[in-house]
């Protein structure tokens, strides 16, 4: 990780932690993530079809950044959501959300990020996902678009 | 710290933690930081020539905010990077990055922030730095521009 | 919490933690927050008249997001501050701040978020608040506007 092999974790250091990075072959929602290569972390949490799956109830800090950009600004409304799904509950629950409207000058090349991060009480089997409104406007570089969490 | 003297840390509270604030005498990259006065924190981590030096391998939440502003908008592309350097590896590794283009109306006074934050597995002797594309457009107020981390 | 009842906390899990969400009946500064319903968390920290009251000295990660939006852009300067007040000290201390100027196209419907998050050494009896420059431009949806912290 981060340019050098991950050290063997000490017994106590089995932190519940994830840091997933942008995956450019995302074709639909929710976004899909790189869970293996590069600066990725995945420990004590599972990754499944775009989602982080909680396996231990508790308090988690959850974060995501999405990098939007385009060749020619037309000010399409942008949204970036972190939401939760659990088979026990019928509806997705939006945990955090960012929206942008009127953010660039018409016709110009543009770029902008949305960052979200907060603490939530999550339950075993909760699935966390990231959704964006305009997939074609997302740049998936690992340093620019990411999704992560850690158990407090 | 924060307007009152820091309490004597309990033995167990020797957290690896840093919160450095903007230093207006930064003249080149990487940015330099205030590591002594004001709302600064530095414990179990060293500060050296703009960088935070890790001395214990493990998981860290790393964050930075940069406040860009200008008297007269000309939409110069802005970038804000947190990157890592280690003598064992030839190249800097960009951990997180934010970019902005076409973000203000030509001619107007403008102001905008970039925020980055995520979890990384860092190794002893890693050096972490912050880079921006346009130094002259950064305001270094301690509440506006900062760089920090803590060990999970 | 988050669509399902909070599990009975284990003894050790009495984390000092808060996540408060936007409350649309805020009429003046500081902002007021929802501390009871929805995805709210409040444990080992008190909520009083818009403020989070620290009752144990130590290191805390503090964060806030505010979602600004308007029907017709006139580029009023926007500011978002997290500040601290303690009866022992005469003046509020601004811990983190975000400002925006020239952020939308005149006359257009617009939307933009400000995110802040960092580590601070807080002392028992410190009161933390959030201030914004233009209350009428804040949208208080729980996923969009929030204020939280946790003890490291």
């Amino acid at each position: 990780q981060i340019g050098h092999p991950s050290p063997p974790p000490e017994k106590k250091e089995l932190r519940k932690v994830a840091h997933l990075t942008g995956k450019s072959n995302s074709r639909s929602m929710p976004l899909e993530w790189e869970d293996t290569y590069g600066i990725v972390l995945l420990s004590g949490v599972k990754y499944k079809k775009g989602g982080l799956v909680i396996n231990e109830t508790g308090l988690y800090f959850v974060y995501s950044k999405v990098y939007f950009r385009g060749q020619s600004c037309n000010n399409l409304p942008l949204s970036h959501k972190v939401y939760m799904r659990n088979s026990k509950y019928p509806q997705d629950l939006v945990m955090m959300e960012g929206k942008m409207m009127s953010y660039c000058t018409t016709g110009q090349m543009w770029a902008r990020s949305s960052y979200l991060g907060a603490v939530f009480n999550l339950t075993s089997a909760d699935h966390l996902y990231v959704n964006v409104s305009e997939l074609s406007l997302v740049n998936f570089e690992e340093s620019q678009t990411f999704f992560g969490l850690y158990k407090l | 710290q924060i307007g009152h003297p820091s309490p004597p840390p309990e033995k167990k509270e020797l957290r690896k933690v840093a919160h450095l604030t903007g230093k207006s005498n930064s003249r080149s990259m990487p940015l330099e930081w205030e590591d002594t006065y004001g709302i600064v924190l530095l414990s179990g981590v060293k500060y050296k020539k703009g960088g935070l030096v890790i001395n214990e391998t493990g998981l860290y939440f790393v964050y930075s905010k940069v406040y860009f502003r200008g008297q007269s908008c000309n939409n110069l592309p802005l970038s804000h990077k947190v990157y890592m350097r280690n003598s064992k590896y030839p190249q800097d590794l960009v951990m997180m990055e934010g970019k902005m283009m076409s973000y203000c109306t030509t001619g107007q006074m403008w102001a905008r922030s970039s925020y980055l934050g995520a979890v990384f597995n860092l190794t002893s002797a890693d050096h972490l730095y912050v880079n921006v594309s346009e130094l002259s457009l950064v305001n270094f107020e301690e509440s506006q521009t900062f760089f920090g981390l803590y060990k999970l | 919490q988050i669509g399902h009842p909070s599990p009975p906390p284990e003894k050790k899990e009495l984390r000092k933690v808060a996540h408060l969400t936007g409350k649309s009946n805020s009429r003046s500064m500081p902002l007021e927050w929802e501390d009871t319903y929805g995805i709210v968390l409040l444990s080992g920290v008190k909520y009083k008249k818009g403020g989070l009251v620290i009752n144990e000295t130590g290191l805390y990660f503090v964060y806030s997001k505010v979602y600004f939006r308007g029907q017709s852009c006139n580029n009023l300067p926007l500011s978002h501050k997290v500040y601290m007040r303690n009866s022992k000290y005469p003046q509020d201390l601004v811990m983190m701040e975000g400002k925006m100027m020239s952020y939308c196209t005149t006359g257009q419907m617009w939307a933009r978020s400000s995110y802040l998050g960092a580590v601070f050494n807080l002392t028992s009896a410190d009161h933390l608040y959030v201030n914004v420059s233009e209350l009428s431009l804040v949208n208080f949806e729980e996923s969009q506007t929030f204020f939280g912290l946790y003890k490291l």
Epitope: - | Q71, S72, T106, G107, W110 | S102
Partner: antibody, heavy 119, light 106 residues
Framework: QVQLVESGGGVVQPGRSLRLSCAAS????????IHWVRQAPGKGLEWVAV????????FYADSVKGRFTISRDNSKDTLYLEMNSLRAEDTAMYYC????????????WGQGTLVTVSS | DIQMTQSPSTLSASVGDRVTITCRAS??????LAWYQQKPGKAPKFLIY???SLESGVPSRFSGSGSGTEFTLTISSLQPDDFATYYC????????FGQGTRLEIK
């Protein structure tokens, strides 16, 4: 009505200092950027400096950078210009002017205060 | 820096005349141009912004036009009160003024 009234001008020797003030009334001072603009005798207008509505940011013309400091006290509705290391070429009428909507143009001007730098 | 050049430097005209003052920018400034009027011993007065928008309270005989690098201030029918010096100012990139055009009685 909007009013800006400058004061503090006078005759000063080269290398010395002077502090100008601009008292504002008739508008919410703390929500406007304010500029200093000067005019040498018989010459055109030259922009000098600006301070943002909340005092957080200040910008200067190259000709005065490092010598002049703009500041404001929003509790007193007053703008200041601290002028150090004055030179003969700083001789001018100094106007404070209110910025329109952060656009770097000026909708209201004071009547000016004359600064003469001469030995 | 963007240079602003006004022409003519001096203009002689009579009451009732239609007069035009030109302002040229050394590079394109879109429409980010303002005009001011200044009388001897007085502060400048704001007339026009964004090249053609008339400030409220300014008589409608004043008008502005142009974009890019060439701009004009026109007074459709000169009144005695209009004899003064006129300045253009660009705010596309920082702030620079033209050298001024003195409008005098013929």
């Amino acid at each position: 009505q909007v009013q800006l009234v400058e004061s503090g001008g006078g005759v000063v020797q080269p290398g010395r200092s002077l502090r100008l003030s601009c008292a504002a009334s008739g508008f919410t001072f703390s929500t406007y950027g304010i500029h200093w603009v000067r005019q040498a005798p018989g010459k055109g207008l030259e922009w000098v400096a600006v301070i943002w509505y909340d005092g957080s940011d200040k910008f200067y013309a190259d000709s005065v950078k490092g010598r002049f400091t703009i500041s404001r006290d929003n509790s007193k509705d007053t703008l200041y210009l601290e002028m150090n290391s004055l030179r003969a070429e700083d001789t001018a009428m100094y106007y404070c002017a209110r910025d329109r909507d952060n656009w770097n143009y000026f909708d209201y001007w004071g009547q000016g205060t004359l600064v003469t730098v001469s030995s | 820096d963007i240079q602003m050049t006004q022409s003519p430097s001096t203009l002689s005209a009579s009451v009732g005349d239609r007069v035009t003052i030109t302002c040229r920018a050394s590079q394109s400034i879109s429409s980010w141009l303002a005009w001011y009027q200044q009388k001897p011993g007085k502060a400048p007065k704001f007339l026009i912004y964004q090249a053609s928008s008339l400030e409220s309270g300014v008589p409608s005989r004043f008008s502005g036009s142009g974009s890019g690098t060439e701009f004009t201030l026109t007074i459709s029918s000169l009144q005695p009160d209009d004899f003064a010096t006129y300045y253009c100012q660009q705010y596309n990139s920082y702030i620079t003024f033209g050298q001024g055009t003195r409008l005098e009685i013929k």
